[in-house]
Every structure is written in C-alpha cells, then in structure tokens.
C-alpha cells in the first residue's frame, strides 16, 4: 500500500482540532488494517506509541489521547485514513505515523509520517537582572517565557523618553532574551519592558533599573 501524507509540517493552535491527512490507494480487503501512532519530538520512530487502530471493521482508540482521537471517515476504507485530534495540548507536538496494511498489497511499507506542532502563545515572561548597576558598570537584563511554540522572540524597549543611548551601549539578543547594557550612566535608570512574541500572540514583563554612583547599586 502506498500512503500519501502532506510534505509540509502541520501547525495547529492550542485547543483547536488538528486534522492529520493520510490517504492511500489499494483494493481494500477484509484483512485491511490501519494504525495511527505517535512519537515525541527527538525520539526515534521505534519508540512510537499507538493511539488508534482500525481492524476487522472496528475502531479502537488507545492510550492517553484516546478520548480525543477519531477518524475523518469511519470506516477508513475509501482511501482516506485522516486522523482528527481535538483540543490539542502542547504535549501533542511530535510525529504521527499513519500505517496502512492490506495484504497482499505489499508494494511499499504503507507508512506516512506527519510532524505536528501545537502553537502556544508565550506565557508571561520572567524579567531578571544581574551585574553591576553602578555608573560605568555593565548589567544584563534577562527575559524568558516558560511556554510558547514556536519559541518566542524577545524584544526589550525602554519606557518613556530618554536620551538615545550611545551606540554599542545597549545590545540585545532576540533569541536568548538578553539585553546587555554597558558603560551605565545615571540616565540609564528607568523601566525596561520585555515583549515575548510568536505567531500566536505576545506577553510582557517589566523591570526597573536604578543606576547609582559607584559607592552603591541596587535594582528595585
């Protein structure tokens, strides 16, 4: 049986229904069987877990996703073996295997792989600071969301209107969420906001930086 699945990965927003398309061509016999299984990201296919079987005219959802899986067409004997997964969770991200067996059609292994990413908006990030907050010193402002798929990008902005910092004194990394402030001056003091963004939305946190004379330094 030759199985056809989309070549592009599938993305579905958190809580929505994912439709994992799988089709095939064969003269369906009484021995026809369909199995859908799931493997977590980064794990080998050999570690897949069954989530649904169809055999002998009956459908058998199985495992932790059993209440949320069904077939677009039941029985799946018309050439369409598409899986529906409702109320998707972050843990549903991974590779899904559609395997069709129909002896004596052994033309190929009857296997198709679909990568699903569950899209999750960024959670409220945590803002933190480390380093010297005295004039002339350097400090790192960090920002990180514990949730978000795809991984959020981070953008730091200083709130209010202040003199433009000298070039090179403010360097940020959108991937790590880190903002490096060098050669601090009293005018570096203020509130800094980090915005974590992905295609599902954004979330932010704020941090107030107080730059002091060299004898003392603190962050509120």
């Amino acid at each position: 049986v030759e199985v056809k699945v989309p070549t592009e990965p599938l993305s579905t927003p958190l809580g929505k229904t994912a439709e994992l398309t799988c089709t095939y061509s064969t003269s369906v016999g009484d021995s026809f069987a369909l199995e859908w299984s799931f493997v977590q990201p980064g794990k080998p296919i050999s570690e897949s877990h069954p989530i649904l079987y169809f055999t002998n005219g009956h459908l058998y959802p199985t495992g932790s996703k059993s209440k949320r899986v069904s077939l677009l067409q039941n029985p799946p004997t018309v050439g369409v073996a598409t899986l529906k997964l409702t109320d998707v969770h972050p843990s549903d991200t991974g590779t899904y295997l559609c395997q069709v067996n129909n002896p004596p059609d052994f033309y190929t292994n009857g296997l198709g792989l679909i990568n699903l990413t569950v899209l999750v908006p960024p959670s409220n990030p945590l803002c933190s600071q480390s380093g010297q907050t005295s004039v002339g010193g350097s400090t790192a402002l960090r920002c990180s969301s514990s949730e978000g798929a795809p991984k959020p990008v981070y953008n730091w902005v200083r709130l209010g209107t202040f003199p433009t910092p000298s070039p090179g004194s403010m360097v940020q990394d959108e991937v790590s969420g880190q903002l490096i402030l060098t050669n601090l001056s009293l005018t570096s003091s203020g509130t800094y906001r980090c915005v974590a963004t992905n295609q599902m939305g954004s979330a932010s946190c704020e941090l107030t930086l107080s730059v002091t004379e060299p004898s003392q330094g603190r962050v509120a």
């Epitope: 089709t23 003269s27 369906v28 016999g29 004596p104």
Partner: antibody
Framework: EVQLVESGGGLVKPGGSLRLSCAAS????????MSWVRQAPGKGLEWVSS????????HYPDSVKGRFTISRDNAKNSLYLQMNSLRAEDTAVYYC???????????WGQGTLVTVSS | DIQMTQSPSTLSASVGDRVTITCRAS??????LAWYQQKPGKAPKLLIY???TLPEGVPSRFSGSGSGTEFTLTISSLQPDDFATYYC?????????FGQGTKVEIK
C-alpha cells in the same frame, strides 16, 4: 482463463427491483475485490459498487447509495447486485469487474442490460 | 468527488499515426490512473494502470505518462485494431470515477 459472466438483467418498471448475478471462474475469487460498473446507452462508464474479498467492506457512490446492495458468496464464486427503487437513469449495461491489487479493473464480464421503463 | 476530464472527445486519425489522448483530474491523484479501451458492444479492456504500467499482453505501442492532475495515453503507431473508445479512471480514493471517453475514429 479468467471468466466473468453476468446474468439477471431485463426490463423493470420504475420503483421496481432486480438482482444481478456474476459467476466467476479462472482465478481465486475469494482473494479478489470485486465491483459493478455500469454504462448507460451511448454514455461513459460509472462505477456503482465494490466489495472486499471476504465481503466485510462495501462501497457505493452517492447515486446508488441506499438503493443498491452488493454481496458475494465465495463458496459459489458468485457476485450479486440487488437493485431496489430503480429509476429510468439506472438503465444501463451492468458489468461485473475484478479489481487489481489497486482499485482498477483488470477483468470484465460481457455485461447484462437493465432497462427501467414504464 | 474527483472529476476526470478527457480531451479530445473525438479524434480522427489514420493507420500509422501517433495519437495522444489527455486526461485531467480535478485534484492531485498522484499516479493512480488507469486507461481502458472499449470497442462497440464489448466490455472495456485494461490498457494501463498506475499511469504508466502495461498489463501483460498489451502491445508496447501503448504508453502512459503523467502524474498529479495531467495524464496522457499515447499510441505510437495507430493500428486498425486500435479504433475504439478510450477511458481514463482514477484509482485513488472512493468514488472511483471515469473520464467521459475519447473516440478514436478513422480519418
């Protein structure tokens, strides 16, 4: 040599019923998916039903669903098509056809004519 | 349902001609396409399946090509026995449907 011989065609009134038969020989019937395909006079081909090797799975297009029933008796090497609530547009030559491993039709019978007319 | 459209509907040709018939599917059917030949009063005969595979006994002057939505049947050198009607059929997902046919007649 593969042989498929249809029978049971004839003239029937609209709303009436008819049962077609197909006698198969020359191959292992119980291992083969089978179909009925029809052809209205002067028109093209239309698939009307299929059945899996052991009869567990049957399929129909919308045009006949609920009116036609395909069945088989592997002990008798026979395929059947029960046609109910017949309409004028069901008038056609009905062919019995064997399916290959993929659902194309590698052997066909000679056909039997069904005429639905008052 | 997947619609199959053949062109031309009728084709006039002479013995020895190279003849090409086109079949288009309304959506991607990969290579799941069969071709049949039918003569008046006779049952269809399988010529090609999987878009390009010839069953045993079909003359090599017949060939098929294409994938996705566009397919062709070619007769490299038309013989007297080839004057007939030709049908394409997708063998992908149910319902399996046929093209409306192409009649190859003597010019």
């Amino acid at each position: 040599e593969v042989q498929l011989v249809e029978s049971g065609g004839g003239l029937v009134k609209p709303g009436g019923s008819l049962r077609l038969s197909c006698a198969a020989s020359g191959f292992t019937f119980s291992n083969s998916g089978m179909s009925w395909v029809r052809q209205a006079p002067g028109k093209g081909l239309e698939w009307v039903s299929s059945i899996s090797d052991g009869g567990l799975y049957t399929h129909y297009p919308d045009s006949v669903k609920g009116r036609f029933t395909i069945s088989r008796d592997n002990a008798k090497n026979s395929l059947y098509l029960q046609m109910n609530s017949l309409r004028a547009e069901d008038t056609a030559v009905y062919y019995c056809a064997r399916q290959g491993v993929r659902p194309f039709f590698d052997y066909w019978g000679q056909g039997t004519l069904v005429t639905v007319s008052s | 349902d997947i619609q199959m459209t053949q062109s031309p509907s009728t084709l006039s040709a002479s013995v020895g001609d190279r003849v090409t018939i086109t079949c288009r599917a309304s959506e991607n059917i990969y290579s799941y396409l069969a071709w049949y030949q039918q003569k008046p009063g006779k049952a269809p005969k399988l010529l090609i399946y999987n878009a390009e595979t010839l069953p045993e006994g079909v003359p090599s002057r017949f060939s098929g090509s294409g994938s996705g939505t566009e397919f062709t049947l070619t007769i490299s050198s038309l013989q007297p026995d080839d004057f007939a009607t030709y049908y394409c059929q997708h063998h992908y997902v149910i319902p399996w449907t046929f093209g409306q046919g192409t009649k190859v007649e003597i010019k």
